[in-house]
Each structure stands twice: as structure tokens, then as C-alpha cells.
């Protein structure tokens, strides 16, 4: 697993560097998670041909993965800091059940999958500190999440592989949009 943000050799070699601001820490955390996702995607793509598959729509019907849309206020046109921050936190909380699903899906990258999951929890905490309107953030229902997890784990092998691929791809895209939006804040 990669070294968590703030613990890389560059930081160690530069003890007089200014401490990271809240925004820099969030940015670094997201990029750390994105690096982890890249490693997981490599294993998924090497193991199966899911990354080139045109049958994604079949599996996508079973999933309700968070997506960024214009109404969420995260794009340059119609940018709204508070609305966008609520969307990012809500989306990350919704992704948690899917990240839990990923935990037993990797052989050589088991540690990496755990690192992505734990780093996402830390990212949510960072963002919650930044948000003013925590009441607007809806937390997913644990019972609904539990039944979704059971349903996903009961899929056949092909659908499980496709689900893994789609979760990683969607999470990467959501994080990249979040990164871009957070840099405007």
C-alpha cells in the first residue's frame, strides 16, 4: 500500500516546510485515494477484460453509484460552494457501502483496497470539518446498505467482476470532479 499523505519521503526530507493547510491536506488525501484506485484498476483490468467491455449497462442497472451533475453546484457554471460540499460529502458516504463490497474482491491488492476505504473515511472527516451546513448531509440507512451488500455479493462471478470495475471507475470520476470543485473553494 502507498504511504499515507504527509508521510512521503519528500515531507520527511523537508522538515522546515510549512504545515499543510486544510485545503492542501484534502487535495493530497484525494490524490492519495486516486493513486490507490489506479492500482486496484490495474489488477481488475489485468484479471479480466471488464475494462474494455461494452456490456457495462447490464451491471449498471443494479447499481446506484453517486454521480456529479450540473445541479450539484460543483461545476464552474453555477458553482455553489455549500451545495457542492454537501454533494461531495453525501456522495462519499454513499460510496462507503461499495468500498466495503470491494474489500474481498482483490488478491494481490487486498491492502490497497483497505487503504482506499480507510482513506475515504478520513477524507469524509476532513470535509465535514469544512462544511457549515452538516444538517443538509443525509447519511445512508445502514439496513438498506446491508441488504445492498448482500445482493451484490450474491451476483454471479461475471457480474461481480463488472460491479468491481464500475465501482472503481465511478469512484475515480467522482473524486476527480470533487478535486476540481474543491480547488475552487
Amino acid at each position: 500500500a502507498p504511504v499515507p499523505p504527509g508521510e512521503d519521503s519528500k515531507d520527511v526530507a523537508a522538515p522546515h516546510r510549512q504545515p499543510l493547510t486544510s485545503s492542501e491536506r484534502i487535495d493530497k488525501q484525494i490524490r492519495y485515494i486516486l493513486d490507490g484506485i489506479s492500482a486496484l484498476r490495474k489488477e481488475t483490468c489485468n484479471k479480466s477484460n471488464m475494462c474494455e467491455s461494452s456490456k457495462e449497462a447490464l451491471a449498471e442497472n443494479n447499481l446506484n453509484l453517486p454521480k456529479m451533475a450540473e445541479k450539484d453546484g460543483c461545476f464552474q457554471s453555477g458553482f455553489n460552494e455549500e451545495t457542492c460540499l454537501v454533494k461531495i460529502i453525501t456522495g462519499l458516504l454513499e460510496f462507503e457501502v461499495y468500498l466495503e463490497y470491494l474489500q474481498n474482491r482483490f488478491e494481490s491488492s487486498e491492502e490497497q483496497a483497505r487503504a482506499v476505504q480507510m482513506s475515504t473515511k478520513v477524507l469524509i472527516q476532513f470535509l465535514q470539518k469544512k462544511a457549515k451546513n452538516l444538517d443538509a448531509i443525509t447519511t445512508p440507512d445502514p439496513t438498506t446498505n446491508a441488504s445492498l451488500l448482500t445482493k451484490l455479493q450474491a451476483q454471479n462471478q461475471w457480474l461481480q467482476d463488472m460491479t468491481t470495475h464500475l465501482i472503481l471507475r465511478s469512484f475515480k470520476e467522482f473524486l476527480q470532479s470533487s478535486l476540481r470543485a474543491l480547488r475552487q473553494m
Epitope: T21, M68, A69, F75, Q76, K172, Q176, S177, R180
Partner: antibody
Framework: EVQLVQSGGGLIQPGGSLRLSCAAS????????MIWVRQAPGKGLEWVSD????????YYADSVKGRFTMSRDISKNTVYLQMNSLRAEDTGVYYC?????????????WGRGTLVTVSS | DIVMTQSPSTLSASVGDRVTITCRAS??????LAWYQQKPGRAPKVLIY???TLESGVPSRFSGSGSGTDFTLTISSLQPEDFATYYC????????FGQGTKLEIK
């Protein structure tokens, strides 16, 4: 071969409209960030706009905001720059390019550029 | 927009010289900075990205450093083919460029 083929430049009167095209081959625009950069005669490079492949989210430089629209047609693997209310200061060579990697860090593939002249 | 300020605008040097070009961002951009070389009538070509990573195929005499707001491009020993215009570009948000540094023969 990975390349970007540009078209659509030309001479246009102030206040007019023009659409530039940039056709990609060797990679898919649906999974890459794309960008337009321009260069006025004898001047430096200026970032115009970029389009993030996810959700087609576009960003514009202040100098073109509200006048230029960057879009894409995934089926044609092509990105466009629709330029309206053109001004003399929009004259220059327009380059289409691809942002390298996901973060993104630099422009690794460039088109050859297309000349836009705004003059009466 | 993030404003990138490059200096000097013009630099006169001789083959074998060591030259340094600087670039300053109007806000912190971490290490999201690239350096390009452009020759007349040609599209720019990337030399350095992420502030200090040398692009594959680019000679090792080119090097980059810096993070946050201040960055430098160094050419350790100028070669005849290095006389061109150099630009920095940030990729933190959007992709604004510095105004360029024309490196000419003294």
C-alpha cells in the same frame, strides 16, 4: 497513431461566429481531459478552455467566458470550440491538446493548430 | 484565473551556459506545474511536468524544481537546439500559462 486533427479556422468579421473541430484518433476523448489553447501572432500561449471527460464539465478562461463553448461528440471522437461574438483580440492560432493522465499534469498530445483571423 | 508570472521575458546566453527561468503562481498550486519549449511555427513540446519530472526523451540537462508558488527551470549546459521560447503552465485549476521566456543567442 495517437493524434489530433484540427479544422474550422478562417477569416471572420468582428461579432461573427466560428466553430473549430478537433478529431482524435488513437485514443478516446470520452476518457481524457481535453483543452484549447490559443496564441496571438507573435505572443505567448493562452489557455482558453478545458473539458473534463466525466459529465462533460467545462472550464473557461475569463477572457472567453460567456462567448466560447467547448463541447464534444463522443460518437465522432471529436471536441469542438464554438466561438461567438468574436473580437479582433481573438485572432491567433488555436491549438487543441490532450491533458496527460488523470490528475492532469501536462499536455502530451497537440494538434497542429488552426488560424483564426477576426478582421473587417 | 490563476495568474502565472514568468521571468525574465528575454534571456541572452551562449552555448555551454547554465540558465535559469523562474515562474511564480498567484496562488499555491502544489507541484502542478509543467514547462514547455516552443519553436517558431510549431506546437509546444513538454519538457518537465509535476514541477520536477523529466518527460521521456528530454535531455537530462533540463531540470525543474519548486512547489507552492515558486518554480524554476534550469538548463545546465545550453546546446544550440535549446534556443527557443519557454513557457510554464499550471494544472491546478484550468491551465493558464506564463507569458514566456525567449532564450536567444548572445
Amino acid at each position: 497513431e495517437v493524434q489530433l486533427v484540427q479544422s474550422g479556422g478562417g477569416l471572420i468579421q468582428p461579432g461573427g461566429s466560428l466553430r473549430l473541430s478537433c478529431a482524435a484518433s488513437g485514443f478516446t476523448i470520452s476518457s481524457n481531459y481535453m483543452i484549447w489553447v490559443r496564441q496571438a501572432p507573435g505572443k505567448g500561449l493562452e489557455w482558453v478552455s478545458d473539458l473534463y471527460y466525466y459529465a462533460g464539465d467545462t472550464y473557461y478562461a475569463d477572457s472567453v467566458k460567456g462567448r466560447f463553448t467547448m463541447s464534444r461528440d463522443i460518437s465522432k471522437n471529436t471536441v469542438y470550440l464554438q466561438m461567438n461574438s468574436l473580437r479582433a483580440e481573438d485572432t491567433g492560432v488555436y491549438y487543441c491538446a490532450r491533458w496527460a493522465d488523470d490528475h492532469p499534469s501536462h499536455l502530451d498530445i497537440w494538434g497542429r493548430g488552426t488560424l483564426v483571423t477576426v478582421s473587417s | 484565473d490563476i495568474v502565472m508570472t514568468q521571468s525574465p521575458s528575454t534571456l541572452s546566453a551562449s552555448v555551454g551556459d547554465r540558465v535559469t527561468i523562474t515562474c511564480r503562481a498567484s496562488q499555491g498550486i502544489s507541484s502542478w506545474l509543467a514547462w514547455y519549449q516552443q519553436k517558431p511555427g510549431r506546437a509546444p513540446k513538454v519538457l518537465i511536468y509535476k514541477a520536477s519530472t523529466l518527460e521521456s526523451g528530454v535531455p537530462s540537462r533540463f531540470s525543474g524544481s519548486g512547489s507552492g508558488t515558486d518554480f524554476t527551470l534550469t538548463i545546465s549546459s545550453l546546446q544550440p537546439e535549446d534556443f527557443a521560447t519557454y513557457y510554464c503552465q499550471q494544472s491546478w485549476l484550468g491551465g493558464s500559462f506564463g507569458q514566456g521566456t525567449k532564450l536567444e543567442i548572445k
